[in-house]
Each structure stands twice: as C-alpha cells, then as structure tokens.
C-alpha cells in the first residue's frame, strides 16, 4: 500500500490507505526492471571489457534498438501524452526479442534476466491498460523476431558480448526516458 502523506511512523495498524494508482504501479515496476538491468550490467562488465568501450565504437553496430526521439513526444519540449505512450509501448514490444536473446547470456544472474523479461511483459500490460483508447500500437511480426533472434545467436563471442552490453544500455536509457515522461502524465 502506498505511504500516506506525512506518515513515517514505525509501528502502525494498517491504515485504510488507497490502492496504488495506475501511475504509481507503473513507476514502481519500471524501477524494479531498472534494478534488474543494473544487476545484469554488473555481471556483463565483470565478464568483458565492453563497459570501457567508447560510445563511438559501440555505436558502430547494426542493431535497431528502440530509442526516444524528439518526434515521439516524450521529451519536455513538444511533450504529447498520447504519442509518447504509443512510443513507450511500441518500444517495449520491440525490446522483447532482445530480452529473449539475453536469456541464455548470464550465469550467476540467470534469474534476474528472466525477471527482467517477465516484468517487461507485465509493464507492457500495465501501460496498455493506461492506453486503452490508443490503436496506433504496432506489434512486431513474430517471424521477423524469430529471424533476428537466430541472427543474433549466430554471432561470434565478442559480438555477442557487445550485443548484450548494447541491449542493456539501450534498454536502461529507454526505461529512464519512459519513467521521466510517465511522471508528467
């Protein structure tokens, strides 16, 4: 239950608090996923030197990872709630194939990788509920996703490490932008 305004006492009987609003629930869920990404990034950085690679070097990749742009209406200037919500949901749906790719990429954080994937599905569901009347949301083609997954898994070890790092970094940035935008809604 959410904390009531001004309440910070230690031992209280259950107050008749309000249930979490849709926005509060989404906010908590994004933070949950971000904490998972941090754990996965930690393992990736310990395992390879990708985290030290320059942004320029990492940018030389052919991954089509979702990214927020000015036209998406999620930034403070030109903010548009409906356009932005569509972008967030569409972006998360596009990230799903990359999160599937991550599933076999971790040893000690295998459960976290699964939790991030599952929680993203839950987040999409929470957001779709918020965007009930928006019909501009396109779902990626399963066949396209399947061939992309096969292609990513066929890369050599160095490229797989690079891909893992890029997915985590991009997903973190996308979620952080989404969190900021959603707090304005």
């Amino acid at each position: 239950a959410p904390v009531l305004p001004g309440e910070d006492s230690k031992d209280v009987a259950a107050p008749h608090s309000q249930p979490l609003t849709s926005s509060e629930r989404i906010d908590k869920h994004i933070r949950y996923i971000l904490d998972g990404i941090s754990a996965l990034r930690k393992e990736t950085c310990n395992r390879s030197n990708m985290c030290e690679s320059s942004k320029e070097a990492l940018a030389e990749n052919n991954l089509n990872l979702p990214k927020m742009a000015e036209k998406d209406g999620c930034f403070q200037s030109g903010f548009n709630e409906d356009t932005c919500l569509v972008k967030i949901i569409t972006g998360l749906l596009e990230f799903e194939v990359y999160l599937e790719y991550l599933q076999n990429r971790f040893e000690s954080s295998e459960e976290q990788a699964r939790a991030v994937q599952m929680s993203t599905k839950v987040l999409i569901q929470f957001l779709q509920k918020k965007a009930k009347n928006l019909d501009a949301i396109t779902t990626p083609e399963p066949t396209t996703n399947a061939s992309l997954l096969t292609k990513l898994q066929a890369q050599n070890q160095w490229l797989q490490d690079m891909t893992t790092h890029l997915i985590l970094r991009s997903f973190k940035e996308f979620l952080q932008s989404s969190l900021r935008a959603l707090r304005q809604m």
């Epitope: 959410p2 008749h16 904490d35």
Partner: antibody
Framework: YPQLVESGGGLVQPGGSLRLSCEAS???????MSWVRQAPGKGLEWVGS????????YYNDNVLGRFTISRDNSKNTLYLQMNSLRAEDTAVYYC?????????WGQGTLVTVSS | DIQMTQSPSSLSASVGDRVTITCRAS??????LAWYQQKPGKAPKLLIY???DRYPEVPSRFSGSGSGTDFTLTISSLQPEDFATYYC?????????FGQGTKLEIK
C-alpha cells in the same frame, strides 16, 4: 537462484521470539514488500508490509505490537521479528512483492509455536 | 475490515469442464481484486489482478470478471494442472484480506 528466499523458521515455545529473513534479489530494493502467512490446512492471511525505505510499516491488528517488519537494503534482506508468539501464529510465512496484489512470492518458511 | 467470502469451498470437476468460482466482498471494492492459484507445498501464484486482467503467461482459459462486491473466476476448460486451491484477495483497503479458498479436485 530464486528471487525471494525466506529462512529462520523453526520450533519455538509460546511466548518466545523468532526472526525470519527474506533474502531478495536486487530487483526488490525499491519495492513495497509484504509478509503473508498460512496456518496448516488454512487460508492466506496478510501480516503486514513495509515501504521501500523502511520508513513506513503497516500491520494486521492481530500482530500489531508483537511483530516488527524491517529491511536492510544494503543486504537486500527483509525481516520479520516475531515476539510473544502464540500457538495461533503457527504457519508457513511467505514474503512477497506488494503491488497491492502480490505478484512474486518466496517459497515460505514454517514457524511452529508449541510447548 | 473487509470480509471476502468464496464459494464453493470445494468443488469436484473433470478435465475439460468449465468451472466458476465466486468471491463476494462485504463492501464495495471497485475492481481491486486478485485471484491466486496454490498447489500443495507451494507458494500462491498470481492469476488475475484488477478483477479481470490476466497476469502475463497465465493461460487464456483463466478469466476474471466482476466489480463492486461480486467477482468470478472462470476456467473455461479444465486441464490436469489446474487442480489446486484458488484464493481471491481484495486490495481496496488495508488490511488486505483473502477469501477462505476453493479447493478444486478431480471428480
């Protein structure tokens, strides 16, 4: 490893104390958490919950004043300190993520209060 | 506190049957209701939240409906793995309260 793992259960005499732990993965650091219990062969009962910072705790009336929920975010661990235990506190105790509904649960730890 | 009453408390059915479990709240709780499935010796698993939203990866044969005081969990075609105990929970106000459970057994 599982995301939530409870420990600390066991046999304790009436009037005694016990501290349960719930080791959580890092994902739960910014989450409200709850303890839920289940007496043998009975239904589920919410015990109480705690805010992410640990600054606010909420309890069911039947444990208020006897049980204390706390957390140590540096250790990713949630605690349930149980004092003045009674026979009716005998149950499997679960920790769970609290989004008002509980979407992730530990496997539970059994607490038996008996002389 | 809000009381949650589930019916029936136990139910025998066969694979392929359509099954309905009901949950009644002692006062209006809007759609703040969740359904869980629990198997012996295991933790509960969330099936439905907000009255009718299926949690991801829960099979589509499970559906929830209702608002206010009366709620229903329906399993459209029972599968062998569905034999378990089902609980409803209100989160309209704390203390959160659960129904007493419905044990679904094989006929």
């Amino acid at each position: 490893y599982p995301q939530l793992v409870e420990s600390g259960g066991g046999l304790v005499q009436p009037g005694g104390s016990l501290r349960l732990s719930c080791e959580a993965s890092v994902l739960f650091k910014h989450q409200d958490m709850s303890w839920v219990r289940q007496a043998p062969g009975k239904g589920l009962e919410w015990v109480g919950s705690i805010s992410p910072s640990g600054g606010s705790t909420y309890y069911n009336d039947n444990v208020l004043g006897r049980f204390t929920i706390s957390r140590d975010n540096s250790k990713n661990t949630l605690y349930l300190q149980m004092n003045s235990l009674r026979a009716e506190d005998t149950a499997v105790y679960y920790c769970a993520r609290d989004l008002d509904f509980m979407d992730e649960w530990g496997q539970g730890t059994l607490v038996t209060v008996s002389s | 506190d809000i009381q949650m009453t589930q019916s029936p408390s136990s139910l025998s059915a066969s694979v392929g049957d359509r099954v309905t479990i009901t949950c009644r709240a002692s006062q209006g709780i809007s759609n703040y209701l969740a359904w869980y499935q629990q198997k012996p010796g295991k933790a509960p698993k969330l099936l439905i939240y907000d009255g009718d939203d299926r949690y991801p990866e829960v099979p589509s044969r499970f559906s929830g409906s209702g608002s206010g005081t009366d709620f229903t969990l329906t399993i459209s075609s029972l599968q062998p793995e569905d034999f378990a105990t089902y609980y409803c929970q209100q989160y309209y106000s704390t203390p959160y309260t659960f129904g007493q459970g419905t044990k679904l057994e094989i006929k």
